[in-house]
Interface confidence: low
Amino acid sequence: FGDEEERRCDPIRISMCQNLGYNVTKMPNLVGHELQTDAELQLTTFTPLIQYGCSSQLQFFLCSVYVPMCTEKINIPIGPCGGMCLSVKRRCEPVLKEFGFAWPESLNCSKFPPQNDHNHMCMEGPGDEEVPLPHKTPIQPGEE
């Protein structure tokens, strides 16, 4: 009974991570936050990057790291697959570099399983991205 209580998943309370295909998580997350409020604060720092539109998978990827999927059947959080991480990094790292910043070490793609299988469960990205998205906000590389 105690174990089941410990494993129970919690509803995702972070607005930007709701309606992404799963609705429960379990903390700590994949970067060590114990509280969803702490995770949300760190997530907000990526909002401009999401608005910029460098990758359609960025929001899903970040949420899978900061509020990983939880299932009652498995006692570990399910984060992103390495392939999704690499796809997002390939598109968004150049944008960060425009502003003089490197890809965060906390999002190092080698930390995530290369693919979803029985040994290492992870979430694949929601569809592939052959066509880059248009910029959605006034933030442009030329501003700097």
């Epitope: 604060l41 907000t44 720092t45 990526f46 990057l49 608005q51 502003f99 910043f101 490197a102």
Partner: antibody, heavy 120, light 107 residues
Framework: EVQLVESGGGLVQPGGSLRLSCAAS????????MHWVRQAPGKGLEWVAT????????YYADSVKGRFTISADTSKNTAYLQMNSLRAEDTAVYYC?????????????WGQGTLVTVSS | DIQMTQSPSSLSASVGDRVTITCRAS??????VAWYQQKPGKAPKLLIY???SLYSGVPSRFSGSRSGTDFTLTISSLQPEDFATYYC?????????FGQGTKVEIK
């Protein structure tokens, strides 16, 4: 070119109020963390407050909580620091700085600072 | 609150010297540490972020490293324009703290 220009500093008596402004240009401040950092004469840097206009998030150092209010007017691309119940120890140069998202938001651009003197 | 204890508070060095400044965090701050340079009467300038990443436009003689809760700024070969005060800074979500500063003076 990215620029931050502070204004509103001056001499004020203890218990008085002052409102500082930080006018941003060259970028959309809505999507950045905007900080106020102060430096007392001959002393080090002290973080005061932060606003994230996009989500209306505000954060304060314990030393100013309840006395100072940080805000932003996105239509004017300007951040503000309303300082009430001022004390002698609030005397400092007040800098406004911005932080880009991700990578732990370090402060990559700073204004030139505005001097606040609290004295009777 | 997380405290950043910076040492030394001042040091004297000559052009060409290797200079090392350390900040110790009172608790784990991941890699959320930046380093700034400040000259008298001027605003601080960002040198290093995320503990070890060199900010664009900053000379490569500046570097940062981390070992546990100890963060280090190194200037490999001090130049005349490097005489200034240096500050470390940590951002732990909603709280930001700076080290006390290290003044690098000419010997």
């Amino acid at each position: 070119e990215v620029q931050l220009v502070e204004s509103g500093g001056g001499l004020v008596q203890p218990g008085g109020s002052l409102r500082l402004s930080c006018a941003a240009s060259g970028f959309n401040s809505s999507f950045y963390f905007m900080h106020w950092v102060r430096q007392a004469p001959g002393k080090g840097l002290e973080w005061v407050a932060t606003v994230y206009p996009y989500l209306d998030y505000t954060y304060y150092a314990d030393s100013v909580k309840g006395r100072f209010t940080i805000s932003a007017d996105t239509s004017k691309n300007t951040a503000y620091l309303q300082m009430n119940s001022l004390r002698a120890e609030d005397t400092a140069v007040y800098y406004c700085a911005r932080a880009f998202p991700g990578s732990y938001h370090p402060m990559d651009y700073w204004g030139q600072g505005t001097l606040v003197t609290v004295s009777s | 609150d997380i405290q950043m204890t910076q040492s030394p508070s001042s040091l004297s060095a000559s052009v060409g010297d290797r200079v090392t400044i350390t900040c110790r965090a009172s608790q784990s701050v991941s890699s959320a540490v930046a380093w700034y340079q400040q000259k008298p009467g001027k605003a601080p300038k960002l040198l290093i972020y995320s503990a070890s990443s060199l900010y664009s436009g900053v000379p490569s003689r500046f570097s940062g490293s981390r070992s546990g809760t100890d963060f280090t700024l190194t200037i490999s070969s001090l130049q005349p324009e490097d005489f200034a005060t240096y500050y470390c800074q940590q951002s732990s979500y909603s709280l930001i703290t700076f080290g006390q500063g290290t003044k690098v003076e000419i010997k």
